[in-house]
């Protein structure tokens, strides 16, 4: 064996292990004939704390008193320096600074399951910074004792490896943990318990759910438990919810009926177990069971609205629209909608099932009284039908809401306000606010939106399917029995100047004046509701200011006459469009020379 300290020794007094704040004496001494050759009195012994010089002395030994060492381990090394040579390593020693163990606190023991083993945990208290040994002792009836030791540096858990059995569930057991290191020892307070106190059942397993006759109202949850379980608690919630419903049951024997589940809803179920009413602890929650409850027939009624469009003297187009039922009303997957159209006087009726749409369009005669009924069907049945009599919604002028306005209200919202109709306002049963994107040409494929408002309301905030920089045609209907009156307005939630001006596509001469025709600005370039068009003209090659004519915007209008041009003068014409935010850039320029006679 190589002697690392063949030249000398480092000794530490009172011990290599000291209490924080203590002083230690370190001595470095050379062995005989190990000093500097020929120059023994020139021996220079140097003490290093790790690699930092802290003391030196000429001679055969060096004594150093060291204080203020930090918690943990510090390495001291002694070296010999001779003239004209490198320092020679003599010896080294470690000093361990720590504290005595604190009393272990909160000792608690548990046995996981009836077949599990007893394991205990405790709080060590502050770190000792020293090797500390923990001994856990368990004593039981008939002077039985078990002991387990732990030499891990951070020991706060030990498993005895023994199984407590339920033969005598009221027998007392006592556990105690003792911590020992070089500076002292300390024991926890004893913890006394019975089998029932410390056995924590295994979580229930094999969880299943059954719905008798595929009905949500006849639902039973089944599970398996350890033999001695007396109590269970169940928790369940819809998968999209954070709040649990909680049920406590006694002597359930692995089954429980649930009475308050909603149909067609995915639920998460968990179960926990306990051996005794007031002793011991609950098991962990079981693994989740996820299951969907069966469908039930829909409740509630569809919100139905309609639009009429004149086709010719004998026919009209009816477009029906309805909103989806809420999930809680649908109570299942809606398979189809049933639409029944009936002529009330003649009794003729036609029924159609609509799948994949929430609208239906048909053509009916303009004569007769017509009614529709719409219901939603799932695998279990149909909702109550919503019945509507088809009438001329805007026929009663005296029922028309007054002073309708539409103003932007924050991002993608429009506030619609109105005044009640002149006719007895108390006759109004409800208002309907309807909106759809404004499309020149009145495209009937554009989706229709509506909301219903109580008769005492004179405003509604519309936000569904509202986009920035789009103009909406908004109608407010006042309904009273089989009569209706309406008013309309254009509105947008956000606007800016149009991106382009109208494109002049033709200029024609008519009896000394001209007719200008143009193409509408594409909807995506209008940037809100158009208020006006402007037609500009000036003589070609002239530097004078152009003249202009401002025309209020009307959806269907795309031509306008001008009669102030001089014959046989060539003019340049162009157009712009305006929203409330400003004027567009010029559209295309066209030249025109009026051929007619001078006045």
């Amino acid at each position: 064996k190589i002697d690392a300290c063949k030249r000398g020794d480092v000794t530490v007094k009172p011990s290599h292990v000291i209490l924080l704040g203590s002083t230690v004496n370190i001595t470095c001494s050379l062995k005989p004939r190990q000093g500097c050759f020929h120059y023994s009195r020139r021996n220079k012994l140097i003490l290093y704390k790790f690699d930092r010089r802290i003391n030196f002395h000429h001679g055969h030994s060096l004594n150093s008193q060291v204080t203020g060492l930090p918690l943990g381990t510090t390495l001291f090394v002694c070296k010999l320096a001779c003239i004209n040579s490198d320092e020679i390593q003599i010896c080294g020693a470690e000093i361990f600074v720590g504290v005595a163990p604190e009393q272990p606190q909160n000792l608690s023991c548990i046995q996981k399951g009836e077949q599990g083993t007893v394991a205990c945990t405790w709080e060590r208290g502050r770190d000792t910074h020293l090797y500390t040994e923990y001994t856990l002792q368990l004593s039981g009836p008939k002077n039985l004792t078990w002991q387990k030791q732990c030499k891990d540096i951070y020991c706060d858990y030990l498993d005895f490896g023994i199984n407590l059995t339920p033969e005598s569930p009221e027998s007392n057991f006592t556990a105690k943990v003792t911590a020992v290191n070089s500076l002292g020892s300390s024991s926890s307070l004893p913890s006394t318990f019975t089998f029932l106190d410390i056995v924590r059942p295994l979580p229930p397993w094999d969880i299943r759910i059954k719905f008798q006759k595929a009905s949500v109202s006849r639902c039973t949850l089944y599970w398996r438990d350890e033999g001695l379980v007396l109590l269970n608690r169940l928790r369940y919630r819809p998968s999209n919810s954070r709040l649990w419903n909680m049920v406590n049951v006694t002597k359930a024997k692995g089954r429980h009926d649930l009475l308050d589940l909603k149909p067609f809803t995915e639920y998460e179920f968990q179960i926990s177990s306990k051996l005794h009413l007031y002793k011991g602890s609950w098991s962990d929650w079981s693994e989740s069971l996820r299951a969907q409850t069966p469908e039930e027939e829909p409740t509630g009624m569809l919100d139905v609205w309609y639009m009429k469009r004149h086709i010719d003297y004998s026919r009209q187009q009816i477009s029906l629209f309805w909103k989806n039922l809420s999930v809680s009303e649908a109570r299942g997957k809606i398979l189809h909608y049933q639409v029944t159209l009936q002529e009330l006087t003649g009794g003729k009726a036609m029924t159609q099932n609509i799948t994949g749409h929430t609208s239906w369009t048909t053509v009916i005669p303009r004569t007769g009284n017509w009614a529709v009924a719409v219901s939603a069907a799932n695998s279990k049945g149909s909702s109550l039908p919503t019945r509507i009599n088809i009438m001329n919604l805007c026929e009663a002028g005296l029922l028309a809401p007054r002073q309708v306005s539409a103003n932007s209200e924050g991002m993608d919202n429009i506030l619609v306000t109105w005044q009640p109709p002149r006719k007895d306002p108390s006759a109004v049963q409800e208002y309907v606010v309807e909106w759809r994107e404004l499309h020149p040409g009145g495209d009937t494929q554009v989706p229709l939106n509506w909301l219903r408002s109580r008769p005492y309301n004179v405003s509604a905030l519309i936000s569904e399917n509202i986009k920035s920089y789009i103009c909406y045609e908004i109608r407010v209907y006042a309904l009273s029995g089989d009569q209706g009156g309406c008013s309309s307005i254009l509105g947008n939630s956000k606007h800016k100047a149009p991106l382009s001006g109208p494109h002049i596509n033709a200029i024609t001469e008519e009896k000394g004046s001209i007719l200008i025709s143009w193409n509408s600005i594409p909807v995506q370039e209008q940037m809100g509701c158009l208020l006006h068009y402007r037609i500009y003209w000036k003589e070609r090659d002239s530097n004078s200011q152009p003249q202009l004519c401002e025309i209020p915007y009307r959806v269907s209008q795309n031509s306008h006459p001008i009669n102030s041009l001089q014959p046989r003068v060539t003019y340049v014409l162009w157009m712009t469009a305006l929203t409330a935010a400003g004027e567009s850039s010029h559209g295309n320029e066209r030249e025109f020379c009026l051929q007619g006679k001078a006045n």
Epitope: Y48, F50, D51, T73, L75, Q89, G92, A93
Partner: nanobody
Framework: QVQLVESGGGLVQPGGSLRLSCAAS????????MSWFRQAPGKGPEWVSA??????????YYADSVKGRFTISRDNAKKTLYLQMKSLKPEDTAVYYC????????????????RGEGTQVTVEP
């Protein structure tokens, strides 16, 4: 008493391999960084490699001259430091010794607290 004892040196041909060991005793080992140094005849000590305190997954550092050829490791349970040397060259000939050190290891020679006596490695055809 603190002790570091190197072993595993010997004579090897160029391109060959050796594995050096350093057995520690008399101190706790685990809380310290450890390094390998070498000293060729007539030259000063040269730092070769280091490994951080703690487990075998401690960070490792190498001198440019040995990067990719030498691998340092430690086994705290056995209180042993290792240096696996591959693709040895004649210029690797030196006495190799282990030491208790402290960083940094990137751009300066590490601080040395205690070193072993060393083991001779000779690389020649």
């Amino acid at each position: 008493q603190v002790q570091l004892v190197e072993s595993g040196g010997g004579l090897v041909q160029p391109g060959g391999s050796l594995r050096l060991s350093c057995a520690a005793s008399g101190f706790t080992f685990e809380p310290y960084d450890m390094s390998w140094f070498r000293q060729a005849p007539g030259k000063g000590p040269e730092w070769v490699s280091a490994i951080d305190k703690g487990g075998g997954a401690g960070a490792t550092y190498y001198a440019d001259s040995v990067k990719g050829r030498f691998t340092i490791s430690r086994d705290n349970a056995k209180k042993t430091l290792y240096l696996q040397m591959k693709s040895l060259k004649p210029e690797d000939t030196a006495v190799y010794y282990c030491a208790i050190t402290a960083g940094p290891y990137s751009d300066s020679t590490p601080r040395v607290a205690y070193r072993g006596e060393g083991t001779q490695v000779t690389v020649e055809p």
